[in-house]
Interface confidence: low
């Protein structure tokens, strides 16, 4: 048969995992120990799987001595649970939905999972995991998940100059790597440069057959949907015009399970005060109850009026709701007509992973 | 592979400008934020702010302002600070840094620039 | 404005030493924090991203930790090539970079 293509060592992979998983561990808390040595075990058993590409490696043979060593002063048993997996699954361990969503509690209830959304789109408007929907200004790089095991960050940049609206133009997702199912696969996507593949090149994760993390590219350089089965989440990348746009739903257990140091997360908690836009009644609805807000830094764009925009917009989001409203306020705001598209498919993705119907169409509140 | 390369070694008198360039090869200037970072002899790293220069949209350490102007050519995919008022104070070296999500990259190899009459 | 000193300031260890330098922030920065190693002469170069991501082609003897207030750079077997000033830089409300660490040789 063909020559195998030798593979790389990916202790360096090991180690980073290790760290990953054991960085926010507090030593005084309940448990440290159980948690080290779930960790422990996972780095040995990531060292094992990279064993034959790493033969005589110096960092590689250290790092095995490293673990042997760990494990003998915490007193941790060679064999036991590892770091992201539940050892009572008898199910499929890299598909979340065939646990009914329990992990790493033995037994419980096996209720279907609560599943929780969160979007941006235009200006941004963010609409958080609890449905309360902002827009904000947010420049730069701000994390909206950053969890135990998802990180999505976005960066945004100014739309227009004198305006403190921002669309998003970078995006970066990392799925954090569980033994067995995955290891990390990191995400990025560009404006103009929306691949349909993580950036070390591959389009899923998992050994073999089992896909428990896959890219479908939908529309070629515009549109991606990640499918995370192992951690039951789901994720839509779009870009309409210059921007991008993004949609995640996500179990509620573990969007929840986060540090206390990780509490910067806009999905959970959305935009800091200082970043929201708003002029204490929204301004998405100050605009449209034809007032434009004292304090605000939103203009009518040469090109289009309060009317205009809001033909516009009721074209495609025949529901004077949120996603209506955002549309008005960014065609204002910036006289860019792809924000219309931008808050329709922002429409279509919650209709497509918001879980409870009777949320999809919401409508405004203040920051 | 993204290279940064900054301009030569600069000699300047009291009171004058100085203008340093940074020209990025190998990945899409336009889409991410080019900083620059002082560093005066034998001391620390300041961040004097940065410029997107998709938009040309700058962002400035307070103590730099209306001392450092940042600027970019598109068309050369050249990022440039100019120091204004030079002063003894100013003698350090200059970096220019892609940022990537929260991170400094790919640096320059910065610029000594010297104040002296 | 939020104060990061690292310490110790100056440090001598012996090659194949575990040596540990410290960041401390003035208030918690969510592990927006990222390291860097300066050779002299040379520009920084980052070692760790987001407080315990090992940047690619960086060896694995070098390690992050810390979260809130602490954070910690660690190279668990010192070698020759790892003399040199190693900064701290936190990224959240601001930029801005730790006072250094001069790591050297006994």
């Known amino acids: 048969g063909d020559c195998q293509q030798p593979t790389q060592c990916r202790i360096q992979k090991c180690t980073t995992d290790f760290v990953a998983l054991t960085a926010h561990l507090n030593s005084a808390a309940d448990g440290f120990d159980s948690e080290f040595c779930k960790a422990l075990r996972a780095y040995a058993g990531c060292t094992q799987r990279t064993s034959k590409a790493c033969r005589g490696n110096l960092v590689y043979h250290s790092a095995v001595l490293g673990i042997s060593d760990l494990m003998s002063q915490r007193n941790c048993s060679k064999d036991g649970p590892t770091s992201s997996t539940n050892p009572e699954v008898t199910h499929d361990p890299c598909n979340y939905h065939s646990h009914g969503g329990v992990r790493e509690h033995g037994g419980g209830d096996q209720r279907p999972p609560n599943y929780l959304f969160c979007g941006l789109f235009g200006d941004p408007h963010l609409r958080t995991f609890k449905d309360h929907f902002q827009t904000c200004k947010v420049e730069g790089a701000w994390p909206l998940i950053d969890n135990n095991y998802l990180s999505v960050q976005v960066t945004n940049v100014p739309v227009v100059p004198g305006s403190s609206a921002t669309a998003t133009n970078k995006v970066t997702i990392i799925f954090k790597a569980q033994h067995e199912c995955t290891d990390q696969k990191v995400y990025q996507a560009v404006t103009d440069d929306l691949p349909a593949a993580f950036v070390d090149g591959t389009t899923s994760g998992g050994d073999g057959d089992v896909k428990s993390l896959h890219i479908v590219e939908k529309e070629s350089g515009r549109y991606v949907e990640m499918h995370a089965r192992y951690i039951g989440t789901t994720v839509f990348v779009r870009q309409l015009g210059r921007y991008l746009t993004l949609a995640i739903r996500m179990p509620e257990d573990l969007a929840m399970s986060y540090e206390e140091s990780q509490d910067l997360q806009l999905c959970v908690n959305g935009c800091p005060m200082s970043e929201c836009i708003d002029d204490g009644q929204g301004q998405v609805s100050a605009i449209l109850g034809h007032s434009l807000p004292h304090t605000t830094s939103v203009q009518a764009w040469p090109g289009y009026t309060l009317e205009t925009a809001s033909t516009q917009c009721h074209e495609k989001m025949p529901v004077k709701d949120i996603y209506f409203q955002s549309c008005v306020f960014d065609l204002l705001t910036t006289g860019d007509a792809n924000f219309t598209a931008a808050a329709h498919s922002a429409l279509e993705d919650v209709e497509a992973l918001h879980p409870r119907k009777e949320r999809w169409h919401i409508f405004p509140s203040s920051c | 592979q993204v290279q940064l390369q900054q301009s030569g070694t600069e000699l300047v008198k009291p009171g004058s400008s100085v203008k340093i360039s940074c020209k990025a090869s190998?990945?899409?200037?336009?889409?991410?934020?080019m900083h620059w970072i002082r560093q005066q002899p034998g001391s620390g790293l300041e961040w004097i702010g940065w410029?997107?220069?998709?938009?040309?949209?700058?962002k400035y350490n307070q103590k730099f302002d209306g001392k450092a102007t940042l600027t970019a050519d598109k068309s050369s995919s050249t990022a440039y600070l100019q120091l204004s008022l030079l002063t003894s104070e100013d003698y350090a070296v200059y970096f220019c840094?892609?940022?990537?999500?929260?991170?400094?990259?790919?640096w320059g190899q910065g610029v000594m620039v010297t104040v002296s009459s | 404005d939020i104060q990061m000193t690292q310490s110790p300031s100056h440090l001598s260890a012996s090659v194949g030493d575990r040596v540990t330098l410290s960041c401390k922030v003035s208030?918690?920065?969510?592990?927006?924090l990222n390291w860097y190693q300066q050779k002299l002469g040379e520009a920084p170069k980052l070692l760790i991203y987001?407080?315990?991501f090992l940047q690619t082609g960086i060896p694995s003897r070098f390690s992050g930790s810390g979260s809130g207030t602490d954070y910690t750079l660690t190279i668990s077997s010192l070698q020759p090539e790892d003399v040199a000033t190693y900064f701290c830089?936190?990224?959240?409300?601001?930029?801005?970079f730790g006072g250094g660490t001069k790591l050297e040789l006994k």
């Open positions: 840094a892609r940022q990537t999500e929260g991170y400094f990259d790919y």
């Open positions: 208030q918690n920065i969510y592990k927006y």
């Open positions: 987001y407080t315990s």
């Open positions: 410029i997107y220069p998709g938009n040309g949209n700058t």
């Open positions: 830089q936190k990224y959240y409300s601001g930029w801005t």
């Open positions: 190998g990945d899409t200037f336009t889409s991410d934020y």
